[in-house]
C-alpha cells in the first residue's frame, strides 16, 4: 500500500468538537502523532492555515466523502491512506461524544488508531494492537503500542535512527547565529518562510521566534541538496525550486512528477546554465529571475518572458548587486535581498532600500 | 502508461439486462479503487457504482441500487457492471474510472476509459 | 445528501480571455473538490483535485480555489483548446456541467 515518501509530515485540524475544548483537542491530537514519532523517523508539525498532509476533521453524516457517517456508536472515524488530496485525511464522526478521559469515546486513543490509517497502517488481527478494528479504552497514560503495530510501521518508515545519523563534517548543520551565514535561496511558503543552505533548511514561521532545521531530504527525498534559487505562487500553492539548469515544481508542499524539468522552458538563451535567485511579485504576477549582475522578468498568466530582458540589477534595483544570492518577497510591498551575510528590505514601490540587516535576523540571532 | 477499456455496451430492450466489462493495465490493479460513471446523451455525468481494491467495499447511486452489481477479477485485471431490469432512463456511455489507493474511496478519478454506449429501448 | 450547483451551465468567451466557472455545496466539503474538463466524445479528463491542486500534465494556466462551500476554477488566459465542458465534483456527486464556447 501507499506510505508517505518524506518523513516531514505536517497536518491541520480544520474544525474542533464542541465536545471537548479546543486546547484538549490540541492535546490529544498532537499525542497521537508522537505516539507514531517516537517509533520512526517521522515528524509531524501542525500548521493552521494552508494545505496539511493530513487533515483532521470533526464531521457529522455526509460530509464530501463516499462515506457518510451513521450517527451515534458504530462507526466512529476513518481515514485515507497516504496521498495527495484527500489522502492522508482523518475524520471522526461529530455524532460522537468526543472525551479525554474513559466516558464517551476517548479521542486520543481513536486519533492514535486513525493516524496509523493515515500514516498507511492496516488493521491488525492483534486484539492488544492499536490497529485492532475495535474501539476498546485503555488507561491513556499507560498507553503503548503493541509490538504488532512498531513491527508494521517500522515494515513502512524504518525505526527513529535512520533518518538521525550524523552530517558529514565537510557538511554539517551551519550555525545558525553565525554572523557570516549567507543563504543559497529563500521564499516563503504560505505563512513560513524556508532559507536553504547546502543540505538543509530552516523553517521559520511568520512572527514567532521558533526555527527549526530540516534535511531537504526529509522533506523531499526526491530533491537535490544545494537549491539555489526558489520563489513561491502562493495563489496556486506552488513553490519552484532551481539548481544547475533544472527545476522542480512543488505542489501544496509536494513534488510534481515529471521533473525535474529545464529552465529554459521559461525561455533563458542558452549561456544562462544557472539562477541566483527569484520573486514572485503577485501585484503584478511576475517572476524576477537574477543571473549573475542581470536579470529577467517573467509573465505567469502568458507564461513567457516580458520583452526588453535581461536589464542590470544595479540599474533597476538602487542599491542592491551587482549580484544576489537570494531574495523572498513579503508584507505586500517589499523585496528582501540577500547579499552574503547581508540582507535588504527592499521597498519596490518607492524603489529604493529601506532597512539594512544581516541576513539570519529573522532568527533572533 | 495506465490504460482502461470498456466493453460489453449494446442494445438491449426494456427489464432486460447487460454485463459491461473493464480491462485495466498499467497499474497494480488490486490496490486501486475503481468505479462506473455514465452519461446520458447530451446530459451531465451520473456516478453509478464504485468497488474497493480487493472487491470487499462496494457503494451503489440509489438510481441503480438493486439492480446492478459491481464485482472485479483481479486475477484477470478486470471491472464489471451486471445490469439488470434496465430501463430507458439507463441509455448512456458507461466510463469506468480510476480512484485511489487505500481502505477508503476518494472519489478522485485520475483516469478513464473511452466508455461504452449501452443503449435501452424497445 | 450534498448538493453541488455549478454556475454558469453556459458561457462565451474569445480566446485570451480570463475565466471563471463556481461551484457551490449545499454543506461544507473541506477542499474536496475536483474539477475535469470533457470534450466532445471523449472521456472527462481530470484537472483540479482537492480545491486548488494541479493535476500532473495540465497546462498551469487552470487554477482551483475555495474550501468549505465555495469553489472556483479559473482559466487566466483561454486558449483555442481550451473550449469544452467542465464538471466541479465530490465524491459520488457531480456539478451540472458548463458549457464554455468561442464567442
Known amino acids: 500500500g501507499p506510505v508517505w515518501r518524506k518523513h516531514y509530515i505536517t497536518y491541520r485540524i480544520n474544525n474542533y468538537t464542541p465536545d471537548m475544548n479546543r486546547e484538549d483537542v490540541d492535546y490529544a491530537i498532537r499525542k497521537a502523532f508522537q505516539v507514531w514519532s517516537n517509533v520512526t523517523p517521522l515528524k509531524f508539525s501542525k500548521i493552521n492555515t494552508g494545505m496539511a498532509d493530513i487533515l483532521v476533521v470533526f464531521a457529522r453524516g455526509a460530509h464530501g466523502d463516499f462515506h457518510a457517517f451513521d450517527g451515534k456508536g458504530g462507526i466512529l472515524a476513518h481515514a485515507f491512506g497516504p496521498g495527495s488530496g484527500i489522502g492522508g485525511d482523518a475524520h471522526f464522526d461529530e455524532d460522537e461524544f468526543w472525551t479525554t478521559h474513559s466516558g464517551g469515546t476517548n479521542l486520543f486513543l481513536t486519533a492514535v488508531h486513525e493516524i496509523g490509517h493515515s500514516l498507511g497502517l492496516g488493521h491488525s488481527s492483534d486484539p492488544k494492537a492499536v490497529m485492532f478494528p475495535t474501539y476498546k479504552y485503555v488507561d491513556i497514560n499507560t498507553f503503548r503500542l503493541s509490538a504488532d503495530d512498531i513491527r508494521g510501521i517500522q515494515s513502512l518508515y524504518g525505526d527513529p535512527k535512520e533518518n538521525q545519523r550524523l552530517p558529514n563534517p565537510d557538511n554539517s548543520e551551519p550555525a545558525l547565529c553565525d554572523p557570516n551565514l549567507s543563504f543559497d535561496a529563500v521564499t516563503t511558503v504560505g505563512n513560513k518562510i524556508f532559507f536553504f543552505k547546502d543540505r538543509f533548511f530552516w523553517l521559520k514561521v511568520s512572527e514567532r521566534p521558533k526555527t527549526s532545521v530540516n534535511l531537504i531530504s526529509s522533506l523531499w527525498p526526491t530533491l537535490p541538496s544545494g537549491i539555489e534559487a526558489a520563489y513561491e505562487i502562493e495563489a496556486r500553492n506552488q513553490v519552484f525550486l532551481f539548481k544547475d539548469d533544472k527545476y522542480w515544481l512543488i505542489s501544496n508542499l509536494r513534488p510534481e512528477p515529471n521533473y525535474p524539468k529545464s529552465i529554459h522552458s521559461f525561455g533563458f538563451p542558452n549561456f544562462v546554465k544557472k539562477i541566483d535567485a527569484a520573486v514572485f511579485n503577485p501585484r503584478f504576477y511576475r517572476t524576477y529571475f537574477f543571473v549573475d549582475n542581470q536579470y529577467w522578468r517573467y509573465d505567469e498568466r502568458r507564461q513567457m518572458m516580458d520583452p526588453g530582458y535581461p536589464k542590470l540589477i544595479t540599474k533597476n534595483f538602487q542599491g542592491i548587486g551587482p549580484k544576489i544570492d537570494a531574495v523572498f518577497y513579503s508584507k505586500n510591498k517589499y523585496y528582501y535581498f540577500f547579499q552574503g551575510s547581508n540582507q535588504f528590505e527592499y521597498d519596490f514601490l518607492l524603489q529604493r532600500i529601506t532597512k539594512t540587516l544581516k541576513s539570519n535576523s529573522w532568527f533572533g540571532c | 502508461e495506465v490504460q482502461l477499456l470498456e466493453s460489453g455496451g449494446g442494445l438491449v430492450q426494456p427489464g432486460g439486462s447487460l454485463r459491461l466489462s473493464c480491462a485495466a493495465s498499467?497499474?497494480?490493479?488490486?490496490?486501486?479503487?475503481l468505479h462506473w460513471v455514465r452519461q446520458a446523451p447530451g446530459k451531465g455525468l451520473e456516478w453509478v457504482s464504485g468497488?474497493?481494491?480487493?472487491?470487499?467495499?462496494?457503494m451503489y447511486a440509489d438510481s441503480v441500487k438493486g439492480r446492478f452489481t459491481i464485482s472485479r477479477d483481479n486475477s484477470k485485471n478486470t471491472l464489471y457492471l451486471q445490469m439488470n431490469s434496465l430501463r430507458a432512463e439507463d441509455t448512456a456511455v458507461y466510463y469506468c474510472a480510476r480512484d485511489i489507493v487505500g481502505p477508503y474511496s476518494a472519489g478522485l478519478f485520475d483516469y478513464w476509459g473511452r466508455g461504452t454506449l449501452v443503449t435501452v429501448s424497445s | 445528501d450534498i448538493q453541488m450547483t455549478q454556475s454558469p451551465s453556459s458561457l462565451s468567451a474569445s480566446v485570451g480571455d480570463r475565466v471563471t466557472i463556481t461551484c457551490r455545496a449545499s454543506?461544507?466539503?473541506?477542499?474536496?473538490l475536483n474539477w475535469y474538463q470533457q470534450k466532445p466524445g471523449k472521456a472527462p479528463k481530470l484537472l483540479i483535485y482537492a480545491a486548488s491542486s494541479l493535476q500532473s500534465g495540465v497546462p498551469s494556466r487552470f487554477s482551483g480555489s475555495g474550501s468549505g462551500t465555495d469553489f472556483t476554477l479559473t482559466i487566466s488566459s483561454l486558449q483555442p483548446e481550451d473550449f469544452a465542458t467542465y464538471y466541479c465534483q465530490q465524491a459520488g456527486i457531480f456539478g451540472q456541467g458548463t458549457k464554455l464556447e468561442i464567442k
Open positions: 454543506q461544507s466539503i473541506y477542499t474536496y
Open positions: 498499467g497499474f497494480t490493479f488490486s490496490d486501486y479503487w
Open positions: 468497488i474497493s481494491g480487493s472487491g470487499g467495499m462496494t
